[in-house]
Interface confidence: medium
């Protein structure tokens, strides 16, 4: 088993809005939950927009999820990680 | 389950600070979500604010964002809520409680402690 | 913000009796996600409150079935089979789907 490293960037989006991304790579299985979590509950699947999970060409895997949230209203939004029994959690940056 | 053991009552002066603790064991810390809430003597609850003891983010109730401030102590497991500009309003029982998103995806003060009493008098 | 109202105010019951609790939300509390985020809590005198429902209908670990949840949109209900001594106190409900999160009122259930 190769645990995902992740890593969570920002963008603009339209006015008063911001896109959140959300990136795995280098993990091994294949499988992977990775969501976007807002006061701990994760979002519904037609607010986030998900990468393919695909190889990087080392043997291991990558993908992403991203979403669109108020700007302001980024501590309130953290990316969830599970993968191989492990989970983790990953803030929005400010 | 778990534990969440509150500090004791407070008699303090308006106008000056308080810092109340949670201090928890038998969970993971760093994965849970801790809120604190607000009961006057026979009165509802008011939802304060959350902190998520894994990044320290948090999540204030409007009506409270200038009267408290969350933190946590990861090392000793404990969250804290320091309340300051005390007035005689402010005068009530305070709780800690964790989420349980993991286990019922979706319960929001599932483990309570057992309150801390804030008496606010000249 | 989101107003919680419970009815009644206090509810007078006879052990054994079925007990029924309202609670109406000024606006309808679907999250974003789907979920609808409502739960009841009980507090005993002197005690913190127990979470005995989540998700409008589910019991939380250790509820006795006697207790159960419905509802949708703006309009919940608890209802208690039978009602037990250990059943009293006052109960409350919450919303958990628009910050800030809100409890309504409260309704004493008491015996009669």
């Known amino acids: 088993t190769v645990p995902p490293m992740v890593n969570v960037t920002r963008s603009e989006a339209s006015e008063g809005n911001i896109t959140v991304t959300c990136r795995a790579s280098s993990f091994y299985p294949r499988n992977i939950i990775l969501t976007w979590r807002q006061d701990g509950v994760s979002l519904s699947h037609d607010t986030q927009q998900w990468g393919d999970v695909l190889p990087d060409g080392n043997g291991t895997y990558q993908t992403w999820v991203a979403t669109r949230i108020c700007a302001g209203e980024e501590q309130r939004f953290t990316c969830y990680m599970e993968h191989s029994g492990n989970h983790s959690t990953h803030p929005v940056p400010s | 389950q778990g534990q969440m053991q509150q500090s004791g009552a407070e008699l303090v002066k308006p106008g000056a600070s308080v810092k109340l603790s949670c201090k928890t064991s038998?969970?993971?810390?760093?994965?849970?979500?801790i809120s604190w809430l607000k009961q006057k003597p026979g009165q509802s609850l008011e939802w304060i604010a959350w902190i998520y003891a894994g990044t320290g983010g948090t999540s204030y109730n409007q009506k409270f964002t200038a009267k408290a401030q969350l933190t946590v102590d990861t090392s000793s497991s404990t969250a804290y809520m320091q309340f300051s500009s005390l007035t005689t309003e402010d005068s009530a029982i305070y709780y800690c409680?964790?989420?349980?998103?993991?286990?019922?995806?979706?319960?929001?003060?599932?483990?309570w402690g057992q309150g801390t009493l804030v008496t606010v008098s000249a | 913000d989101v107003l919680m109202t419970q009815t009644p105010l206090s509810l007078p019951v006879s052990l054994g009796d079925q007990a029924s609790l309202s609670c109406r939300s000024s606006?309808?509390?679907?999250?974003?996600?789907?979920?609808?985020?409502l739960e009841w809590y009980l507090q005993k005198p002197g005690q913190s409150p127990k979470l005995l429902i989540y998700k409008v209908s589910n019991r939380f670990s250790g509820v006795p079935d006697r207790f159960s949840g419905s509802g949708s949109g703006t309009d919940f209900t608890l209802k208690i089979s039978r009602v037990e001594a250990e059943d009293l106190g006052v109960y409350y409900c919450?919303?958990?789907?628009?910050?800030?999160?809100?409890f309504g009122g409260g309704t004493k259930v008491e015996i009669k």
């Open positions: 606006q309808n509390i679907v999250h974003i996600n789907g979920n609808t985020y």
């Open positions: 919450f919303q958990g789907s628009h910050v800030p999160w809100t």
């Open positions: 038998g969970f993971t810390f760093s994965d849970n979500y």
């Open positions: 409680a964790r989420h349980d998103y993991y286990g019922t995806s979706g319960a929001w003060f599932a483990y």
